[in-house]
Structure formats: structure tokens, C-alpha cells
């Protein structure tokens, strides 16, 4: 009688993780007597997934009755596969001996892959805000994947950026890998709205890619642009000066006023405005009462945005002797040649 | 967790015998070849010997003859028995697990044997 | 038998210095090399196997390379828990798995 071959047919099976192998094996015949063990690896290292003979393997069953007389089957089942599980698993052949089986033949060997979908992107931004013209970086990062070919881009906005770096790790073989990328996005004043988007494209995914998203909300800061007025004399010895704080993100903003260099009020930001373009503006106005003050009065409007150094704008506000009038003996000029703006 | 504790290390005279275990917890010890290996004070490393989850012995050309390796499934515990010593053989004994790799993934804090008249 | 020869035996690097140490074997290996770290009074640790594949749980910052006869394992920033002694092994199907002599990486 020819002697007995063990035949692994599938040379290499592919199988998603969470699902069941079927790791495939015969013999040509029942003799010699004895057992059947899976090995992964070869060599003294190599480990044990199956003995038929004894031994507790909760993920392995066997696809027919291997205790039935004339059974030639050998086939496996392991199930839920990790990639932790790749590897090459050989079908061995034991003849029976005493006091130990002896190993008698051995298949050809079938080379488990496994495929794993990739984690669902995560995109971190600087840990600083950062302002309009600044260019930041944004880091996007994907593990648990196999095999190892992955596609990475990057969008803001809907359209795909061009400035990053993409690193798959590790270089060698793994029963996994990650995926770790850093894009360059130039701000503009127009990003408080805008969005940069990571995509991930992978064989597990079938064509259905996985996005991470970060919002530049969370990078940008619009600084403020000031603007100091004074308005029309409300009664014969008050002056109305408003401070106009245009276009600033986030929201965050404390405003002080100042009659010649002395802190005459501060507030804090409460009903702005919000712009189409998802910046903020607020209005302050500062009623001065003009007799109570003999010389000219320099009001200055300061603006501490974001925990930024303040940023101020000031006002001449000229007080003039003036021939008495309506019982009136200062006045407030209100000429374009007395404003004078001081950054 | 994977652990592995050495013992059964001391201080024998050249010629004597000293059997040292490692006992196995954290994995399913009957599954993977377990391996020795050695390190004389401030030297390098020296595998000594390894048995296969079949039983297979392995042995270095320095320990053949004198060493037996022996692996208890039941009790998932390793074990060197270490004839005729020598003052060669004063090292740290690790234990290690093996990979299908044919790598030593974990391994013991160690157990001193001396060897010394 | 495989003999291993590491460069140097000594390596002194300042933390957040690249190292790169080298082991080369007597005759082939393929790609079964692996590296091993050791701390004094502690326990080898499996860093890098099948030349670079690293271990789980080891960081990137750790990086194998070279097939045949010449390998290198590189760090890329000295990290103040990285000077040790590393050790490469080859470990191709068969025994006595050998190892290197060592590199010890010191503080400059």
C-alpha cells in the first residue's frame, strides 16, 4: 500500500477578522495509526492549535467526526480570527507509539491572512490657536489594519490638499499596522466654518472609506479689527464714543476703557453679533461727561481677545473753552481733524 | 498576565546536581515550546536548552549530556535538572516562553546558580 | 553554528540622539533576527523580531532592518529608559539559537 501523504490543498487562505478559518487536511490513508495535530510555525517554537488526542482548544473545532474509524478528514475550523492569528499552520500526522506518539508526516503548510478593517480616523489639531496666514498642522491616525496597503488623503473643505506625510508602520511584517499622517493647512480668515477632513481607503472597506474630521473652529483665532467713534453730543455735556470690535473668533473677549491712560470701565463680550462668516462683532459705547474735565481727554478702547496681549484704538476728545451758551460752559468738538487713531 | 517564576537556583560544589523549575500562569502552557536561558555574571546571553509542546528536547553542545530538560503539562511547570556542574555554569537561569517564531517573547526574573568550591 | 558579531560594544548617545548599532552573522539567516533589551537587574525583553517586525507594545521610536548576514536596529530618539544592553539572536526553524555579544548604550 502507497504510503500515507497529508495533503493541505489551500496553499494560502484570506479570511476578515471576526470570522471563522477553515484550515483544510487529509490523508491519503489510515495507516499508520494515530493521531493528528495543528501546528503554527515550524521549527522547536512551533505551537500548538490542535491535538485530536488531548488538550483544550475553545476556538477550534473540527470539520467532521474524527473520532469515526475510517476518517481521513482532518480539516479545522478556527473561529474568531484576530490578526494575532496569521501565520503559516501545518497538518501533522502522529504514529502511535509508546510511551509518546512519534511525528510522521507533516502537510505542505496553509498560510493564514487575515484582513482587518482600519480604525475609524481620529484627526487632532495644534494645541495652540493659531491666526489667519499661519499654516498648522493636523495629525490623522488609523490602527488595527491588515493587509498592510492603505490609501490616506486629506480635504479641507472638499478639496483634497496636497502638503502632507503618511507613514504606515511597522515597516516589516505585522499581524497588524497603523497608519499615522500630518497635513499642512494654511488659515484664512474665512476658516471658522471650514473643516479638514482625513479619508482612509482600505481593501476591508469595499470602497466605502472611513473619515475623521477636525474643525478649524477649534484651531483658528480672528484677531479683532477696532474702531473708535464719537457720536453726535447727546446732551450739552456728554459725549457718546463707541468702540466697534469687528471680526474676532472665538468668542472669548474683555474690553476696557480708558480716560487718559485710567481704567474708566471694563466688560466682557456678552451679545455679539455673529458674521456669515462665523466671526463675532460687539459694539462698546462710553457716555464721557465733558464738564467734569478741564483739559483734552485721550479715550482709548483696549481689547483682550483669547487670553492675546491687549490691542487698543484711541480718541482725542477736545475739551474748549467756550463763550457761555444755553448754560453751557464746555463743549465737545466732533471735527474729523480731532480723532486721532493710536495703535 | 503572562508570568513566569524561576527557582531551585543556590550554591553547589563542581560535580553536583541542582534541579531548577519554572513555574508557568497567564497562558496555556501545553500550547508553546518553553526554552533556558543563561547569563554568567556580567556576560552575555546563552540559550542552554528548549522542549518543543511535543516534547522534543533541544540542548547546547556546552550542556549536552549533563542538562535534561523536562516539562510538567499538568502543573504548566518547566523544569532543568543540571548534573555534573562546572564553575562555567555559574549564570543567572532564565525561563522563557516561545513563540511560533521561534523568539522568547516572556521570560522569568531569573534564579542564580554558583557553582564553587 | 551561527555566530553573531555586535557594534559596537559600547555606544555612548545623549537622550533625544539617534543610535544605530549593528549584528552580523557568520552565514545567512534570511530575515530570522531578533533583537532584545536589557535593563541591569532585569530580564531580557523582546524587542524586534523576523528582523524588523516589533513586539507588541513596543514603541516606534525602535526600528529593525537588514536580511542575509548584515542587520541594524536603530533608535531614533534616546528616550532616558533606553540605555541598556541590547542583544540580537537569530532564530531561523532550527537550535542552538545564538546570540549576539551585546552593544551597551550609555549616556554620553
Known amino acids: 500500500e502507497e504510503e500515507l501523504q497529508v495533503i493541505q490543498p489551500d496553499k494560502s487562505v484570506l479570511v476578515a477578522a471576526g470570522e471563522t478559518a477553515t484550515l483544510r487536511c487529509t490523508a491519503t490513508s489510515l495507516i499508520p495509526v494515530g493521531p493528528i495535530q495543528w501546528f503554527r510555525g515550524a521549527g522547536p517554537g512551533r505551537e500548538l492549535i490542535y491535538n485530536q488526542k488531548e488538550g483544550h482548544f475553545p476556538r477550534v473545532t473540527t470539520v467532521s467526526d474524527l473520532t469515526k474509524r475510517n476518517n481521513m478528514d482532518f480539516s479545522i475550523r478556527i473561529g474568531n480570527i484576530t490578526p494575532a492569528d496569521a501565520g503559516t499552520y501545518y497538518c501533522v500526522k502522529f504514529r502511535k507509539g509508546s510511551p509518546d506518539d512519534v511525528e510522521f508526516k507533516s502537510g505542505a503548510g496553509t498560510e493564514l491572512s487575515v484582513r482587518a478593517k482600519p480604525s475609524a480616523p481620529v484627526v487632532s489639531g495644534p494645541a495652540a490657536r493659531a491666526t489667519p496666514q499661519h499654516t498648522v498642522s493636523f495629525t490623522c491616525e488609523s490602527h488595527g489594519f491588515s493587509p498592510r496597503d492603505i490609501t490616506l488623503k486629506w480635504f479641507k473643505n472638499g478639496n483634497e490638499l496636497s502638503d502632507f506625510q503618511t507613514n504606515v508602520d511597522p515597516v516589516g511584517e505585522s499581524v497588524s499596522y497603523s497608519i499615522h499622517s500630518t497635513a499642512k493647512v494654511v488659515l484664512t480668515r474665512e476658516d471658522v466654518h471650514s473643516q479638514v477632513i482625513c479619508e482612509v481607503a482600505h481593501v476591508t472597506l469595499q470602497g466605502d472609506p472611513l473619515r475623521g474630521t477636525a474643525n478649524l473652529s477649534e484651531t483658528i483665532r480672528v484677531p479683532p479689527t477696532l474702531e473708535v467713534t464719537q457720536q453726535p453730543v447727546r446732551a450739552e455735556n456728554q459725549v457718546n464714543v463707541t468702540c466697534q470690535v469687528r471680526k474676532f473668533y472665538p468668542q472669548r473677549l474683555q474690553l476696557t476703557w480708558l480716560e487718559n491712560g485710567n481704567v474708566s470701565r471694563t466688560e466682557t463680550a456678552s451679545t455679539v453679533t455673529e458674521n456669515k462668516d462665523g466671526t463675532y462683532n460687539w459694539m462698546s459705547w462710553l457716555l464721557v461727561n465733558v464738564s467734569a474735565h478741564r483739559d483734552d481727554v485721550k479715550l482709548t478702547c483696549q481689547v483682550e481677545h483669547d487670553g492675546q496681549p491687549a490691542v487698543s484704538k484711541s480718541h482725542d476728545l477736545k475739551v474748549s473753552a467756550h463763550p457761555k451758551e444755553q448754560g453751557s460752559n464746555t463743549a465737545a468738538e466732533n471735527t474729523g481733524s480731532n480723532e486721532r487713531n493710536i495703535y | 498576565d503572562v508570568q513566569l517564576v524561576e527557582s531551585g537556583g543556590g550554591l553547589v560544589r563542581p560535580g553536583e546536581s541542582l534541579r531548577l523549575s519554572c513555574a508557568a500562569s497567564g497562558f496555556t502552557f501545553t500550547n508553546y515550546a518553553v526554552t533556558w536561558v543563561r547569563q554568567a555574571p556580567g556576560e552575555g546571553l546563552e540559550w542552554v536548552s528548549l522542549?518543543?509542546?511535543?516534547?522534543?528536547?533541544y540542548y547546547a553542545d556546552s550542556v549536552k549530556g549533563r542538562f535534561t530538560i523536562s516539562r510538567d503539562n499538568s502543573k504548566s511547570t518547566l523544569y532543568l535538572q543540571m548534573n555534573g556542574l562546572r564553575a562555567e555554569d555559574t549564570a543567572v537561569y532564565y525561563c522563557?516562553?516561545?513563540?511560533?517564531?521561534?523568539?522568547?517573547?516572556?521570560w522569568g526574573l531569573g534564579t542564580l546558580v554558583t557553582v564553587s568550591s | 553554528e551561527i555566530v553573531l558579531t555586535q557594534s559596537p560594544g559600547t555606544l555612548s548617545v545623549s537622550p533625544g540622539e539617534r543610535a544605530t548599532f549593528s549584528c552580523r552573522a557568520s552565514q545567512t539567516v534570511g530575515s530570522k533576527l531578533a533583537w532584545y533589551q536589557q535593563k541591569p537587574g532585569q530580564a531580557p525583553r523582546l524587542l524586534i523580531y523576523?528582523?524588523?517586525t516589533r513586539a507588541t507594545g513596543i514603541p516606534a521610536r525602535f526600528s529593525g532592518s537588514g536580511s542575509g548576514t548584515e542587520f541594524t536596529l536603530t533608535i531614533s530618539s534616546l528616550q532616558s529608559e533606553d540605555f541598556a544592553v541590547y542583544y540580537c539572536q537569530q532564530h531561523t526553524d532550527w537550535p542552538p539559537y545564538t546570540f549576539g555579544g551585546g552593544t551597551k548604550v550609555e549616556i554620553k
Open positions: 523576523d528582523a524588523n
Open positions: 522542549i518543543s509542546v511535543t516534547g522534543t528536547t
Open positions: 522563557a516562553k516561545v513563540t511560533w517564531k521561534n523568539v522568547f517573547d516572556y
